[in-house]
């Protein structure tokens, strides 16, 4: 059980307050994090309160200020990037939002030799993506979905691709589903170790179908929006990778590099490319039909000028209970042979752990094991390995970070986070500078977070980064929620849930239950982790009792519950939520005629087939942006977890498990729904077809769009949004206002 | 020493079936890739399948589609050739050949086995 | 499917002379380029791999060259035991189906 921090003295309680939806909306209680900008094994930057950017000197202890504000707020620089041989910064200024990862933005460079702005060759603007080489100050940068190098900042460029065209190829940057759905990045492109070689993908989408909605702007009329983007079954883009030499980049030009005949013989993804050395490269390729993965390590022949693609350096991944990996496939961390890598997968028991493979998968050791999964390798050194997991205490919803060392034999194991701050932290993720020398441990909770610097060798801690005194103090007399985070055995299944409870909980009264979720494949709602947010207001003000509950296709519990939703998206996770709320009505002190059920994206999806279950269980409900259909959204995602959407594969199961054959459901249950109008993950097509289906049925129901407003409703919307849904609810279970 | 040993072949009726088998010795079969290559009388080589090393991926030329089936057996360190709806076309002597390692090219082959397909 | 195309189909030399074998590929096919030597009755056997590389045990008078699109087997002194049909395999990528080319006979003049 998690207490949030106690209010022991009951004199206090008079001079303390429940939080306010105001307090949410403004962010009054928001943390900060500290991650350090590595720019060695002992130095990293980071950018000061009053936005200088500064480099601190680990061992030295000393500071100094690099890059000063004044000169950052010369050109209205948001972001900084300081090339490895130190000698110039690019400052980002004019950010503008594309997509969930990608921006395009106005790029300066600064020369720091001399204190002056790099003039003649300026960088056209604006640019998709610029980056430096790891080594010197080249660089590469996506110009109108094109490539372009320098080799230093002043020089003119030279164009690597020709062929880049919006919404048809793009060189270097992904389309929206690579973006979205594999890559997870604003970039597809990547130097080599020494800069040598620059490697990127070419997405061709020209035979992709379209889709199209109005943005409404100020204007007479609406523009249209387009996107190439693959719903399921649909034709997908043609993804080739390339690679070209930097010294000598008209030499020879990009060189392809090819794909494993086992994956070219249908249709594929390109999933990740890892630099082993600066003559070796790692690609990992996927069929459509995610189930099988091959990682393809390539070497560069000097005498042909060309990679060459072993196929004994083709290494085979695959699933035979569900998709291959977890939500991506992993990725490979090399050891210091170059050839001999660390990986995340599945062991004999359906656990994810981490393996050493040195020459083919079926001869991997496994060096993690044990009913709980390892989640990321963070660094593989000469004789150490850091990974987190959530073995300890056998808490899922629980990260530590642990050191394995591989120098000796038999390795030993230790767990580095486990013991520091036990009850403030049991969350945690790392930040590594070069070889390990130091690392930074930031704590997401339960507690307040906070972010530390330790030594690499002794795991000692050095300093705090950043602990959140000021949050500390203005909680002190805010009376927040109990947490506690607990499982319920139910036919072999085990339901791992986190309840929030107002703060004078009393078990002998009755309380009305929200149920927040999202259940998508491979995620993981409960979690150890400090947060102030809408449900915590829901709570400490208007005495909800609000729970979240993880069933079966949520991850890190290994494969059972992970691939049971495999090809049946829509049933069991449905039914898991059921089975908990019926669970939690048995405790006694919910009030089982004022539950209510909400969710956003696939929780929206999840909640309005609850609402739609005809158990009578649920009052009211809300689903913000959620999918109605499997056939509306992206293949990729899709198709990962539902096969395709033909006679001959899974189109039943995709007819089944829609929103809208279930609109005579809601008939007795209040439903609001919600979507942004410019929605470009899920498009308002899913909220309109559950509008229609529900019209159709004659079935009433409420509903609020957002103009102009895409997947994540933000700004003044956000406001709007979490007021409207504070009403809904406060009517739904007759709060007073 | 390498060696493959091809057996099966015989005088078939056009629409009959077949299996070839190829025997192998002097390599640690089931770490190789492996294929069919076939010359009608008089003719030059036609690749026909190919199968991985793990038995997991098959691969057939356009003219073998659907019609032949290419397996292997690591315990028995034996390829097989399954050939089903034979036609006169398919009249050949069918040699077993192992893959290099790295690259598919065939480093060693087999002597070859005749099939007659007539009516 | 990439198709190889050899030339000439005959050849015919005396012991002692110098062959050059042609084997141009209907699309690049990089290095990936193999040829073979198949005698009368007898199965192929590897003379050349990665388009210049000597398999192992096969004599110096061997010799390939190329890449892309044109390649070439020279046989520098031609012996008796040379006499043969000689074959090119494309293997490009590794990808199926892997092609042949219709063949070289080099006969004795």
């Known amino acids: 059980i998690v207490l949030r921090p106690s209010r022991v003295h009951n004199s206090e309680e008079n001079t303390m307050r429940a939080l306010t939806l105001k307090d949410i909306l403004n962010g009054t209680f928001s943390y900060k994090t500290f991650f350090p900008n590595w720019i060695s094994g002992q130095e990293y930057l980071h950018q000061s309160a009053d936005n200088n950017i500064v480099l601190y000197n680990i061992e030295t202890g000393q500071s100094y200020t690099i890059l000063s504000n004044r000169t950052m707020k010369s050109v209205n620089a948001s972001n900084y990037g300081l090339s490895p041989d130190r000698q110039f910064v690019y400052l980002e200024s004019d950010y503008s939002k594309l997509w969930r990862y990608s921006y395009t933005a106005t790029y300066y460079i600064y020369d720091l030799s001399n204190g002056e702005f790099v003039r003649g060759n300026e960088l056209p603007r604006p640019i998709q993506y610029l980056c430096w080489s790891p080594v010197g100050s080249k660089l590469a940068y996506v110009y109108q979905n094109n490539i372009y190098l320098k080799q230093r900042p002043g020089d003119p460029p030279f164009q690597i691709t020709f062929n880049g065209r919006e919404n048809k190829i793009f060189n270097g940057i992904p389309d929206w589903v690579y973006e979205e759905e594999m890559l997870a990045t604003k970039y597809a492109l990547w130097w080599s170790p020494n800069g040598k070689f620059l490697a990127y993908a070419e997405f061709n989408d020209t035979d992709i179908p379209v889709i199209a909605y109005s943005y409404y702007g100020d204007e007479q009329y609406p523009r249209t929006i387009n996107i190439p983007y693959p719903k399921a079954g649909a034709k997908n883009p043609v993804v080739r990778i390339f690679i070209i030499d930097t010294t000598y980049p008209a030499y020879v030009g990009p060189q392809e590099v090819p794909v494993p005949a086992m994956i070219a013989s249908s249709d594929y993804y390109f999933s990740w490319l890892t630099w082993v050395t600066d003559e070796r490269v790692c690609l990992q390729w996927l069929k459509r039909v995610q189930n099988v993965s091959v990682l393809s390590i390539c070497d560069f022949r000097e005498d042909w000028q060309t990679w060459d693609c072993p196929k004994t350096q083709e290494h085979i991944e695959e699933s035979r209970t569900g998709w291959a990996g977890g939500f991506f496939v992993s990725t490979p961390v090399f050891s210091y042979d170059a050839i001999s890598y660390y990986k995340i997968f599945s062991d004999k028991d359906g656990y994810k752990h981490i393996h050493y493979i040195k020459d083919t998968v079926e001869n991997a050791i496994q060096i993690t094991s044990g009913k709980w999964e390892a989640i990321n390798i963070f660094r593989v050194t000469q004789d150490s390995l850091f990974y987190s997991s959530n073995e300890f205490e056998e808490y899922p919803g629980r990260r530590n970070i642990y050191r394995i060392s591989i120098g000796s034999y038999p390795p030993s194991k230790k767990c580095v986070t486990c013991h520091l701050r036990k009850e403030r932290c049991q969350y945690y993720t790392a930040s590594f500078s070069d070889y390990a020398k130091y690392y930074a441990l930031v704590c997401y909770g339960p507690g307040i977070p906070i972010s530390t610097l330790h030594d690499g060798r002794t795991d000692q801690e050095i300093k705090i980064l950043e602990e959140n005194k000021e949050l500390e103090n203005a909680l002190k007399n805010i009376q927040l929620p109990k947490e506690e985070i607990k499982k319920l055995e139910v036919d072999e299944i085990t339901l791992w849930y986190k309840m929030i409870l107002p703060p004078q909980f009393d078990r002998s009264k009755k309380y009305p239950l929200l149920i927040q979720v999202y259940g998508g494949p491979c995620s993981q709602s409960v979690r150890s982790v400090f947060a102030v947010n809408w449900i915590s207001y829901l709570a400490s003000k208007e005495g909800m009792v609000i729970a979240l509950v993880d069933g079966r296709g949520t991850a890190f519990q290994g494969d059972k519950l992970l691939y049971a939703v495999y090809r049946k998206l829509g049933v069991y996770e449905v039914e898991d939520q059921i089975t908990a709320v019926r669970k939690f009505i048995e405790m006694g002190f919910i009030d089982e005629k004022r539950i209510a059920i909400w969710g956003w994206s696939y929780g929206g999806y999840v909640s309005s087939l609850a609402l739609a279950s005809g158990t009578g269980l649920f009052k009211c409900g809300i689903a913000v942006a959620p999918v109605s259909s499997w056939e509306y959204y992206a293949s990729v995602y899709t198709e990962r977890f539902m096969g395709l959407p033909t006679k001959d594969d899974n189109l039943e199961h995709y007819k089944n498990s829609t929103v809208m054959a279930r609109a005579e459901y809601f008939r007795n249950v209040d439903y609001l729904l919600i979507h942004g109008t410019a929605d470009d993950n899920v498009h308002f097509q899913n909220s309109a077809q559950i509008a229609k289906a529900l019209v159709n049925a004659q079935v009433d129901f409420q509903a609020m769009w957002y103009s102009d407003q895409n997947h994540g409703l933000s700004g003044l919307s956000t406001n709007h949004l979490y007021t409207h849904m504070t009403h809904f609810l406060k009517q739904c279970f007759s709060l007073s206002d | 020493d390498v060696q493959l040993v091809e057996s099966g072949g015989g005088v078939v009726r056009p629409g009959e079936s077949l299996t070839l088998s190829c025997a192998a010795s002097?390599?640690?079969?089931?770490?190789?890739?492996m294929g069919w290559v076939r010359q009608a009388p008089g003719e030059g080589l036609e690749w026909v399948s190919g199968i991985r090393g793990s038995g997991g991926s098959t691969y057939y030329a356009d003219s073998v589609k659907g019609r032949f089936t290419i397996s292997r057996d690591s315990s028995k360190n034996t390829l097989y050739l399954q050939m089903n709806s034979l036609r006169a076309e398919d009249t050949a002597v069918y040699y077993c050949?192992?893959?290099?390692?790295?690259?598919?090219?065939?480093?060693?082959w087999g002597l070859g086995t005749l099939v007659t397909v007539s009516s | 499917e990439i198709v190889l195309t050899q030339s000439p189909g005959t050849l015919s030399l005396s012991p002692g002379e110098r062959a050059t074998l042609s084997c141009r590929a209907s699309?690049?096919?990089?290095?990936?380029l193999a040829w073979y030597q198949q005698k009368p009755g007898q199965a192929p056997r590897l003379l050349i791999y990665d388009a210049s590389n000597r398999a192992s045990g096969i004599s110096d008078r061997f010799s390939g060259s190329g890449s892309g699109t044109e390649f070439t087997l020279t046989i520098s002194r031609l012996e008796p035991e040379d006499f043969a049909v000689y074959y090119c395999?494309?293997?490009?990528?590794?990808?199926?189906?892997?092609?042949f080319g219709g063949g070289t006979k080099v006969e004795i003049k």
């Open positions: 050949a192992k893959e290099n390692n790295r690259h598919s090219f065939f480093e060693y």
């Open positions: 395999q494309q293997y490009y990528n590794n990808w199926p189906p892997l092609t």
């Open positions: 699309q690049s096919v990089g290095y990936y």
């Open positions: 002097g390599f640690t079969f089931s770490s190789y890739d």
